[in-house]
Amino acid sequence: VSPTFQVVNSIAPVQECSTQLDIVIVLDGSNSIYPWDSVTAFLNDLLERMDIGPKQTQVGIVQYGENVTHEFNLNKYSSTEEVLVAANKIVQRGGRQTMTALGIDTARKEAFTEARGARRGVKKVMVIVTDGESHDNHRLKKVIQDCEDENIQRFSIAILGSYNRGNLSTEKFVEEIKSIASEPTEKHFFNVSDELALVTIVKTLGERIFALEA
C-alpha cells in the first residue's frame, strides 16, 4: 500500500489449511506405566492445543494392556473442553501384558470406522504411547502394514521409565517402537526418559501432527 493508500502490490493469501484430522491416541495402560497422571497430564497438554469439533479435529482414545478398551470414540465429544474433561477421567486399566499389536489393530479396525465417528476423506492419525516391548510383537509387522495400507499416519512414543528403573537395555524396545512410526522415522518417533518427561514432547508432537494438515 502506498502512502496514499493505493494498492501497489498484492500477494495471494497462503492456501487455507484444512483443520480436519481424525486422531486416535492409543495408550498403554499396563501397570508399568507409573505414575498414570503423567499420562493424563500429557493428554491434557496435547489436547488443549487442538481445535476439536465435528467439522475440525476429532479425537478418540483407546487404552490397551492385556486387552483393549475404547475410552471414547472420535465423535463422542464436540469441543476441546469436553474432550479435556473426559481425558482427565481416564483410569489406568492395569495388567502385566503389553499387547501393542492388538491395541493398534483394534484402533485401525474399530476406532477409525464411520460407526465410531471417522469421516470419509479425512486424514487419519494414530499416536501410540507405550513403555515396553509388546507381548504380541510377532503380529506387529502385519498390523503396521495394514495401517500403512489404510494411510494411517503413525506417531510412536517410547517411554523408557520401566527400563531405566530396572537398569535394562532399551535398544530392542526402541527399535520396536521406531518400527511402528511412519516414515520418516525421525519425524514420527519420540522417546522420553520416563513418564514425567512426556509433557516435554507435547509442543513438537503437536506441531508435527498439525503439519499433516497443510
Epitope: N31, G94, G95, R96, S162, R165, G166, L196
Partner: antibody, heavy 124, light 108 residues
C-alpha cells in the same frame, strides 16, 4: 467404586493355622498387585508381601519370607494371607492394599492407593 | 534397606496452624518415589501424596509434599479438626516398601 473388603476379626491360640481374605471390586482385580501390611498394637506399618492375582506371582519382604503365605483366587477376586502356626507375636491388624505401580522384571515400585478396612488377628 | 526417620515424633498444634512434618531417608530415594499416608484411630491408612509431591484424588490442597533425594516434607497449610492423626512416609524405589515410624499431629 474401588473397594477392598477384608474378612472379620479372628481370635486364635498359638500353634493354630489361619487364613484371612481380601476381596476386591470396582476394578479389574486380576490386573493390579495387592499388598499386605502389618500393624502391631500401637506400632507403625510394615510391608509383608505382594501378589498379582492374575497369575499369583508373589514377592515377600525378607522379614516375612517363610513366616506367612500369600495366595489368590482370581475367579473370586480374592487375595489371602495365611499362617500355618500362629505365634503370640502375630497379634496385629493386617491390611490389604492395591498397588498403583508394578512389580515386574525384578523391580517393584508404586504406592498403595486403596486399602481394606483391616483384619484384627489376636493370638493368645 | 532404606530406613526412613520421621520427625518430630509428636507435633502439638492448634486448628488453623501450619504443620510441617519431616521424613529423612538413610539413602537417596530413587525418582522421588515417596508417599505420605494419614491414619486416624481405628481406621486404615489413607493415601495423601505420592511421587513426593502429587496429591492423591480427593485430597484437599492444604496438603502438600516436597523434597527429593533424602529429605522430604509434608506440609498442612492450615490444620482442620479432621487433620489430627498419625502421618507415615513410605519409600518405594528399592523393590520393597518401607515406612517411617510415624508423626502424631495432636491438638494443643
Amino acid at each position: 467404586e474401588v473397594q477392598l473388603v477384608q474378612s472379620g476379626a479372628e481370635v486364635k491360640k498359638p500353634g493354630e493355622s489361619l487364613r484371612i481374605s481380601c476381596k476386591g471390586s470396582g476394578y479389574s482385580v486380576t490386573s493390579y498387585w495387592i499388598g499386605w501390611v502389618r500393624q502391631m498394637p500401637g506400632k507403625g506399618l510394615e510391608w509383608m508381601g505382594i501378589i498379582y492375582p492374575g497369575d499369583s506371582d508373589t514377592r515377600y519382604s525378607p522379614s516375612f519370607q517363610g513366616q506367612v503365605t500369600i495366595s489368590a483366587d482370581k475367579s473370586i477376586s480374592t487375595a489371602y494371607l495365611q499362617w500355618s502356626s500362629l505365634k503370640a507375636s502375630d497379634t496385629a491388624m493386617y491390611y490389604c492394599a492395591r498397588l498403583q505401580g508394578d512389580c515386574s522384571g525384578g523391580t517393584c515400585y508404586g504406592h498403595f492407593d486403596y486399602w481394606g478396612q483391616g483384619t484384627l488377628v489376636t493370638v493368645s | 534397606e532404606i530406613v526412613l526417620t520421621q520427625s518430630p515424633g509428636t507435633l502439638s498444634l492448634s486448628p488453623g496452624e501450619r504443620a510441617t512434618l519431616s521424613c529423612r531417608a538413610s539413602q537417596s530415594v530413587s525418582s522421588s518415589y515417596l508417599a505420605w499416608y494419614q491414619q486416624k484411630p481405628a481406621q486404615a491408612p489413607r493415601l495423601l501424596i505420592y511421587v513426593a509431591s502429587r496429591r492423591a484424588t480427593g485430597i484437599p490442597d492444604r496438603f502438600s509434599g516436597s523434597g527429593s533425594g533424602t529429605d522430604f516434607t509434608l506440609t498442612i497449610s492450615r490444620l482442620e479438626p479432621e487433620d489430627f492423626a498419625v502421618y507415615y512416609c513410605q519409600q518405594y524405589g528399592t523393590s520393597s516398601w518401607t515406612f517411617g515410624q510415624g508423626t502424631t499431629v495432636e491438638i494443643k
